[in-house]
């Protein structure tokens, strides 16, 4: 029977933090700084991500792995890997072309990002309205009118500091 | 309205130094995350970056023109200031201010460009 | 550094034409890259960012597509005012920018 040889790429025996250095007798070259090989067997480094500006390192770069990068306070991360920062508002905004405004009266934001959504309308679900909406939070939903006793009341007004969700636009 | 007037071009001898000047009015350089830089573009080639400055006041450079070129602000004339020293003819080209992101998302890209001045180096 | 190289450098097509245009980095960007059209005399105008996002204001008709290291600018039926040149820029590490690919009117 023929023998078959198998030959070995020598450069599958790099790890991964260094590459086959083609200018060295294909030797396993550790990675320069600021660059990483995740997996054996490269033939190259590739850049470490640079975070700047409105972005910053949350994890550095190693010979093994790439950085990682997050926002600057006063933003939030937005697509894949953070490659983008949108600007945060405050509870009770939404942030739109013009910046942070006021969410309109019926709806409401409970984070810092994303955009206002309408109070829940319990009535949908035979419910009354237990503590009123406010620009930062949902009504709460309480027992059909029905299940209350007479005489009690359907609303609880909300706690003092919050005050009704209404804002001119 | 986001707007970014350069000037401080013209013809300026070979060996010597330019300083460009670039007024930004409708933000703040110094607005939290807030990235502006400067960009030239030779008599018909493409564009080349140069450098940049954040509000923290971290700066970035191209590697190849890091030894000639200085970015810099001046938060109190809300102006951004490009000094290339050591000129040579080609260096001659239109040089752009331009602002990072957009006007709520911000990440590695310019959005707002000034209509650029363009500086010839000559004897 | 990270090299950007764009694909046709130039081309000609005719009103309706659907153009594409490629960028591919000498390595791998996430999503790092905008496009950009430019017009004679004028500064760069901002189309695509964080490679498929349109700017504000900016036609459907344009459109960005890719990741890692390959990245195309499509312009489904193009127009009159589009006859420009269009550049790559990536911003994973520092910025460059592509060569630039001009179209031209057929």
């Known amino acids: 029977f023929e023998r078959t040889r198998s030959l070995q790429d020598p450069c599958s025996n790099c790890p991964a933090g260094t590459f086959c250095d083609n200018n060295r007798n294909q030797i396993c070259s550790p990675c320069p700084p600021n660059s990483f090989s995740s997996a054996g067997g490269q033939r190259t480094c590739d850049i470490c991500r640079q975070c700047k500006g409105v972005f910053r390192t949350r994890k550095e770069c190693s010979s093994t792995s790439n950085a990682e990068c997050d926002c600057t306070p006063g933003f939030h991360c937005l697509g894949a890997g953070c490659s983008m920062c949108e600007q945060d508002c405050k509870q009770g905004q939404e942030l739109t072309k013009k910046g942070c405004k006021d969410c309109c009266f019926g709806t409401f934001n409970d984070q810092k990002r994303g955009i206002c959504r309408p109070w829940t309308n319990c009535s949908l679900d035979g419910k009354s309205v237990l503590v009123n909406g406010t620009k930062e939070r949902d009504v709460v939903c309480g027992p059909s009118p029905a299940d209350l006793s007479p005489g009690a009341s359907s609303v609880t007004p909300p706690a003092p500091a919050r005050e009704p969700g209404h804002s001119p636009q | 309205e986001v707007q970014l007037v350069e000037s401080g071009g013209g013809l300026v001898q070979p060996g010597g130094s330019l300083r460009l000047s670039c007024a930004a009015s409708g933000f703040s350089l110094s607005t939290g995350g807030v990235g502006v830089g400067w960009i030239r573009q030779a008599p018909g080639k493409g564009l080349e970056w140069l450098a940049l400055i954040d509000w923290a006041d971290d700066k970035y450079y191209s590697p190849s023109l890091k030894s000639r070129l200085t970015i810099s602000r001046d938060n109190s004339k809300n102006t951004l200031y490009l000094q290339l020293n050591s000129l040579r003819a080609e260096d001659t080209a239109v040089y752009y201010c331009?602002?990072?992101?957009?006007?709520?998302?911000?990440?590695?890209?310019?959005?707002?460009w000034g209509q650029g001045t363009l500086v010839t180096v000559s004897s | 550094d990270i090299q950007l190289t764009q694909s046709p450098s130039s081309l000609s097509a005719s009103v309706g034409d659907r153009v594409t245009i490629t960028c591919r980095a000498s390595?791998?960007?996430?999503?790092?890259l905008a496009w950009y059209q430019q017009k004679p005399g004028k500064a760069p105008k901002l189309l695509i960012y964080?490679?498929?996002n349109l700017e504000t204001g900016v036609p459907s008709r344009f459109s960005g597509s890719g990741s890692g290291t390959d990245f195309t600018l499509t312009i489904s039926s193009l127009q009159p005012e589009d006859f420009a040149t269009y550049y790559c820029?990536?911003?994973?590490?520092?910025?460059?920018f592509g060569q630039g690919t001009k179209v031209e009117i057929k």
């Open positions: 964080d490679a498929s």
């Open positions: 331009a602002r990072g992101g957009s006007d709520t998302v911000i990440g590695d890209w310019f959005a707002y």
């Open positions: 390595q791998s960007i996430g999503s790092y």
């Open positions: 820029q990536q911003g994973y590490y520092l910025w460059t």
